[in-house]
Interface confidence: low
């Protein structure tokens, strides 16, 4: 665990119960960098400071997670706390693995979504396709598409079938898939972001 995570946790622990509630609500509407999904509202609202820190780091990685936390704290008028958080993060940035510091490739190349960039790797490496389908069903997948993917015999063929529908998706639809991947296989997403 890196220094940024500790700094985020320190900041959130020092919020009052009311401030933490306000922080979560602001987090639901704060502008996000391209390629990043939003933490689901249902899960978010029941979290304590430690849960929320874990979720921020798994969704946004340490560097962007700290930056986002500082932005929300500033929006709440807690400039001093935001400054302390960023100071602590920058102080430790040299010690963290270089890959963690880099923004995701989807942010670096706005023309190509993360999902499209890493199509081959996702087909080969995603293991819990059923989970993704449940997350996407009714939002970007029709009942027919959902059943068609489920009918495939292996995970790679399921993912291939899923990707056959993505040409019709807009950026937001692809964000939903990325968000579902972050929730179900965050280590895979982080690995691909560093690659």
């Amino acid at each position: 665990m890196g220094r940024a995570r500790d700094a985020i946790l320190d900041a959130l622990e020092n919020l009052t119960a009311e401030e933490l509630k306000k922080f979560k609500l602001k987090l639901l509407s704060v502008p996000l960098r391209e390629g990043y999904g939003r933490i689901p509202r249902g899960a978010l609202l029941s979290m304590d400071a430690l849960d929320l820190t874990d979720k921020l780091v798994s969704f946004y990685l340490e560097t962007y997670g700290a930056e986002l936390t500082a932005n929300v704290l500033r929006d709440m008028g807690l400039q001093e706390m935001a400054g302390q958080l960023q100071a602590a993060t920058h102080q430790g940035s040299g010690a963290a693995p270089a890959g963690i510091q880099a923004p995701p490739q989807s942010a670096a190349k706005p023309g190509l979504h993360f999902i499209d960039q890493h199509r081959a790797a996702l087909i080969a490496r995603v293991t819990n396709v059923e989970w993704l389908l449940d997350a996407l069903y009714g939002k970007v997948l029709t009942d027919e598409q959902y059943q068609a993917v489920r009918a495939e015999p292996t995970n790679p063929s399921k993912m291939r079938k899923l990707f056959s529908f993505t040409p019709a998706w807009n950026w937001t639809c692809k964000d939903l898939l990325l968000q579902a991947l972050r929730e179900s296989q965050s280590y895979l997403v982080e690995d691909l972001e560093r690659s």
Epitope: M1, D10, L45
Partner: antibody
Framework: EVQLQQSGAELVRPGSSVKMSCKTS????????ITWVKQRPGQGLEWIGY????????EYNEKFKDKAALTSDTSSSTAYMQLTSLTSDDSTIYFC???????????WGQGTTLSVSS | DIVLTQSPASSAVSLGQRATISCRAS??????????MHWYQQKPGQPPKLLIK???TLESGVPARFSGSGSGTDFTLNIHPVEEEDTATYYC?????????FGGGTKLEIK
């Protein structure tokens, strides 16, 4: 008074499934999570996973991801754990507990003993 | 995963004396505000009982002879003076990250 009452002992066949319950009372069920812990006789405690009953959000110990499924029913203030593809290795006692702030476990059920035998 | 190592595995302490149980984490489980380490007591045939949370905060209803200390990776549970009813197994547990882990336990016997 906060109480967690677990279902009675189970004797099941290898390869089958079992669903045990943890009925809570004395507090607002949806304001807390419920965690499940495994303990083999004379041995230590193993964390299985938890569920935030307010929204059904779950987290599992990787070791139990394909073994346990946690659910809850807010109308009866009851949490459930289903264990599948049972083997003799699953024969032991299982506890449910309430998750308090800081993710410590402040109230525990009395335990459900599972015996898997042909 | 963070591993918690408890020592000793078992201990026999004379009535009225001090019992000390150690728990070492394989990495820090503390921030400047809190330590995410908790202590439980378990008697035979019973579920565990929370004694101390956040390394040093005594749970409501727990006798003051129980105390906890430590931060970072090293934590201690002290019982002083020990009483007959303290015969039990004691476990530490961290909640720093998933998966939450328990220590292997320390069996305390009162002489």
């Amino acid at each position: 008074e906060v109480q967690l009452q677990q279902s009675g002992a189970e004797l099941v066949r290898p390869g089958s499934s079992v669903k045990m319950s943890c009925k809570t009372s004395g507090y607002t069920f949806t304001n807390y999570g419920i965690t499940w812990v495994k303990q083999r006789p004379g041995q230590g405690l193993e964390w299985i996973g938890y569920i935030y009953v307010g929204n059904g959000y779950t987290e599992y110990n990787e070791k139990f991801k394909d073994k346990a499924a946690l659910t809850s029913d807010t109308s009866s203030s009851t949490a459930y754990m289903q264990l599948t593809s049972l083997t003799s290795d699953d024969s032991t006692i299982y506890f449910c507990a309430r998750i308090a702030q800081g993710r410590c476990f402040d109230y525990w059920g009395q335990g459900t003993t599972l015996s898997v035998s042909s | 995963d963070i591993v918690l190592t408890q020592s000793p595995a078992s201990s026999a302490v004379s009535l009225g004396q001090r019992a000390t149980i150690s728990c070492r984490a394989s990495q820090s489980v503390s921030t400047s505000s809190y330590s995410y380490m908790h202590w439980y007591q378990q008697k035979p045939g019973q579920p565990p009982k929370l004694l101390i949370k956040y390394a040093s905060t005594l749970e409501s209803g727990v006798p003051a002879r129980f105390s906890g200390s430590g931060s970072g990776t090293d934590f201690t549970l002290n019982i002083h003076p020990v009483e007959e009813e303290d015969t039990a197994t004691y476990y530490c547990q961290h909640s720093w990250e998933l998966p939450y882990m328990f220590g292997g336990g320390t069996k305390l016997e009162i002489k």
